[in-house]
Each structure stands twice: as C-alpha cells, then as structure tokens.
C-alpha cells in the first residue's frame, strides 16, 4: 500500500518546507485515495472485462451512487463553498457503504481496498473540521445501508464485478470533481 500523506521520506527530510495548509492536506489525502483506487481498478480490469463494457450497459445499473451536479455548488459556475462542502461530505458518507462492499472483492489488493476505506474515513474527519454547518449534513441510515450491503452481496458474479467497477469509477469521478472545488476553499 502507498505511504499515507505526510509520511513520505521527502516530507520528513524537509523540515524547512512551509507546513501544509488545511486545503493542501485534504488535497494530498484525496490523491492518496485516488492512488489506491487506481490500483484497485487495475486489478478489476485485469480480472474481468468490465472496463471494456459499453457505457450503455454501465448506465443501466440501479446503483444510487453519489454524483456531482451543477446545483451542488461545486462547479465554477454557481460555486458555493458551504453548499459544496456539505455535498462532498454527504457524498463521501454515502460512499462508505459501497467501500464496505469492496472489502471482500479483491485478492491481491485486499490491503489497498482497506486503505481506501480507512483513508476516506480520515478525509471525512478533515472535511467535517472545515465545515461550518454540520447540521446540514445528513448521515445515511445504518439499517438502510445494511440491507443495501446484503442485496449487493447476493448478486450473481457478473453483477458483482459490474458493481465493483461502477463503484470505483464513480468514486474516482466524485473525488476528482471535489478536488478542484476544494482548492478554492
């Protein structure tokens, strides 16, 4: 697994560097997660042909994965720091159940899947410290999450492969959209 942000030898060996701002630390954390997603996607693509599946087939899934939209205030047009931050935190909280689903889906990258899950929890904590309006953040219902997890795990092999691919792709897109917005905060 890659070294978590702030723990690589270059950071330790360079005490003269300016300390990272809160935004830069969050940025590094997201990149670390994306690093992990990249490794997981490689295993998924090597193991199944999901990565070659047509966009149409992928679109016909019934997963309710978080996605950025114009109204969320995270795009340059209509950018709204507070609305956007709430959307990012809420989205990450919603992704947690899907990251839990990924935990038993990898053979050679089992550690990497765990690292992505744990790093996302840390990222959520970073972002919650940044948010002024924590009341606006809705936490997913644990019972609903538990039944969703059971349903996903009961799918046939092909659907489980498809689900894994879609989760990784959607999570990556969500984080990438978040990155540029968080740069402004």
């Amino acid at each position: 697994a890659p070294v978590p942000p702030g723990e690589d030898s270059k950071d330790v060996a360079a005490p003269h560097r300016q300390p990272l701002t809160s935004s830069e630390r969050i940025d590094k954390q997201i990149r670390y997660i994306l690093d992990g997603i990249s490794a997981l996607r490689k295993e998924t693509c090597n193991k199944s042909n999901m990565c070659e599946s047509s966009k149409e087939a992928l679109a016909e899934n019934n997963l309710n994965l978080p996605k950025m939209a114009e109204k969320d205030g995270c795009f340059q047009s209509g950018f709204n720091e507070e609305t956007c931050l709430v959307k990012i935190i809420t989205g990450l909280l919603e992704f947690e159940v899907y990251l839990e689903y990924l935990q038993n889906r990898f053979e050679s990258s089992e550690e990497q899947a765990r690292a992505v899950q744990m790093s996302t929890k840390v990222l959520i904590q970073f972002l919650q410290k940044k948010a002024k309006n924590l009341d606006a953040i809705t936490t997913p219902d644990p019972t609903t999450n538990a039944s969703l997890l059971t349903k996903l795990q009961a799918q046939n092999q092909w659907l489980q492969d498809m689900t894994t691919h879609l989760i990784l792709r959607s999570f990556k897109e969500f984080l990438q959209s978040s990155l540029r917005a968080l740069r402004q905060m």
């Epitope: 300016q18 935004s23 830069e24 940025d27 590094k28 997201i30 990149r31 670390y32 994306l34 690093d35 990249s38 996605k67 950025m68 340059q76 792709r169 990556k172 897109e173 969500f174 990438q176 959209s177 990155l179 540029r180 917005a181 740069r183 402004q184």
Partner: antibody
Framework: CQSVEESGGRLVTPGTPLTLTCTVS????????MSWVRQAPGKGLEWIGI??????STWYASWAKGRFTISKTSTTVDLKITSPTTEDTATYFC????????????????WGPGTLVTVSS | AAVLTQTPSPVSVPVGGTVTIKCQSS???????LSWYQQKPGQPPKLLIY???KLASGVPDRFSGSGSGTQFTLTISGVQCDDAATYYC???????????FGGGTEVVVK
C-alpha cells in the same frame, strides 16, 4: 496508441462564434481532465480552462471566463469561442491532464498538434 | 490572477554545458503543482517535469526540477543540440483554481 487531435480552426470575422473540437483516441475520456491552451503567433502559452470529463465540471482562467465555453461528448471535448476578437488569433491546443496516473495532477502529458484560428475582418 | 516570471530569456549555452532556468511566482503554487514544458517551433509543448521535481515518462535524466512555494528551477545538465527550444513553466493555484504559464525561456545551444 493514445492520441489527441484538434480541428475546426479557420478564418472567422470578429463576433462570429467558433467551436473547436478535440478528438481523443485510445483514451477513456471519463478517466481524465482535458485542458485547452492557446498560443498567439510568436507568443507564449496561455491556459484557457479545463473540463473534468467524468462529471462535466469546467474551470476557466480568470481572463477566459465568459469568453470561452468548454463542453464534452463521450469522445470529444469542444471549445467554443463565444465572440472572437482579433486578439483571439492563435493556435489552440487540447491537452490531457494526466491525473489518472497515481494521483499526480496538473501536468499536461499528452498534446494535440494544435489548430489555427485567425480572426480578421 | 497569479503571474509567473521566467528568467533569463534568451539564454545561450555550449554543448555539454549546464543551463538553469528560474520560474518565480507572484503567489504560492498550490501543492507544488509546477510543471515544465519544452516546445520546438511548429510543435506542441512536451511535458518534462511535473509537481516541481518529478521526471515525466521518457524524459532523459539530464533534465531536473527543484523548488517549492514561489521559486522553482529547471536545470539541464550536459546540454545537447536537441535541447535548443523554448521552455515554459506552468503553475496551479488555489486562487479561483487558476493555472498560469510563465512567459517562456528560449535556450540557444552553441
């Protein structure tokens, strides 16, 4: 083989909107961000803006806001020059932001040859 | 918006020599998102260095980058005739999420 190519550059009169197209091959656009950069004859490079193809989120340089619109389809990224002036005469490049590779972003690692836009009355 | 100033330009260097190009930013570059590009006449730019010091794939190790914050440097050691080109730095910023290029430095190989 991965490649990027721009098209649509031509001579236009001031005020006539023009759309340039960037076509990619060997690349899943939803995995990347794509930037547009321009270069006036004999001058330096200017970053115009970027589109995160997965979400369609766009970000523009301060000077470019309102003057350009970036959009995408599944295999192309378009740059619309909303109301060209003579100062927009330049070669326009489309470049991939290599941010899918292990989280290293903000590097334009694959460029097209460019397409020339001439704005003149 | 941030301004990136490159010095010197043009710069003349003998074959086998070393050339250092500086890129100074008017504000701190976000997370050291500073990349360097080489451009030859009639061609698109080519990525050399990203995140201030990481060598891009396929780029000879005679190219190196260093710096952080507002001051960055591109060094070409053991200069070859093929290195004659214009070099640009590109910085990423948190200010309105802008990116900006430096004005370019022409390297003439004698």
């Amino acid at each position: 083989c991965q490649s990027v190519e721009e098209s649509g550059g031509r001579l236009v009169t001031p005020g006539t909107p023009l759309t340039l197209t960037c076509t990619v091959s060997g690349i899943d656009l939803s995995d990347y961000a794509m930037s547009w950069v321009r270069q006036a004859p004999g001058k330096g490079l200017e970053w115009i803006g970027i589109i995160y193809a997965g979400s369609g989120s766009t970000w523009y340089a301060s000077w470019a806001k309102g003057r350009f619109t970036i959009s995408k389809t599944s295999t192309t990224v378009d740059l619309k020059i909303t109301s060209p002036t003579t100062e927009d005469t330049a070669t326009y490049f489309c470049a991939r932001d290599g941010y899918d590779d292990y989280g290293d972003f903000d590097r334009l690692d694959l460029w097209g040859p460019g397409t020339l836009v001439t704005v003149s009355s | 918006a941030a301004v990136l100033t490159q010095t010197p330009s043009p710069v003349s260097v003998p074959v086998g020599g070393t050339v250092t190009i500086k890129c100074q930013s008017s504000q701190s570059v976000y997370n050291n998102f500073l990349s360097w590009y080489q451009q030859k006449p009639g061609q698109p730019p080519k990525l050399l260095i990203y995140q201030a010091s990481k060598l891009a794939s396929g780029v000879p190790d005679r190219f190196s980058g260093s710096g952080s914050g507002t001051q960055f440097t591109l060094t070409i050691s053991g200069v070859q005739c093929d290195d004659a080109a214009t070099y640009y730095c590109l910085g990423g910023y948190d200010d309105d999420a802008d990116n900006a290029f430096g004005g370019g430095t022409e390297v003439v190989v004698k």
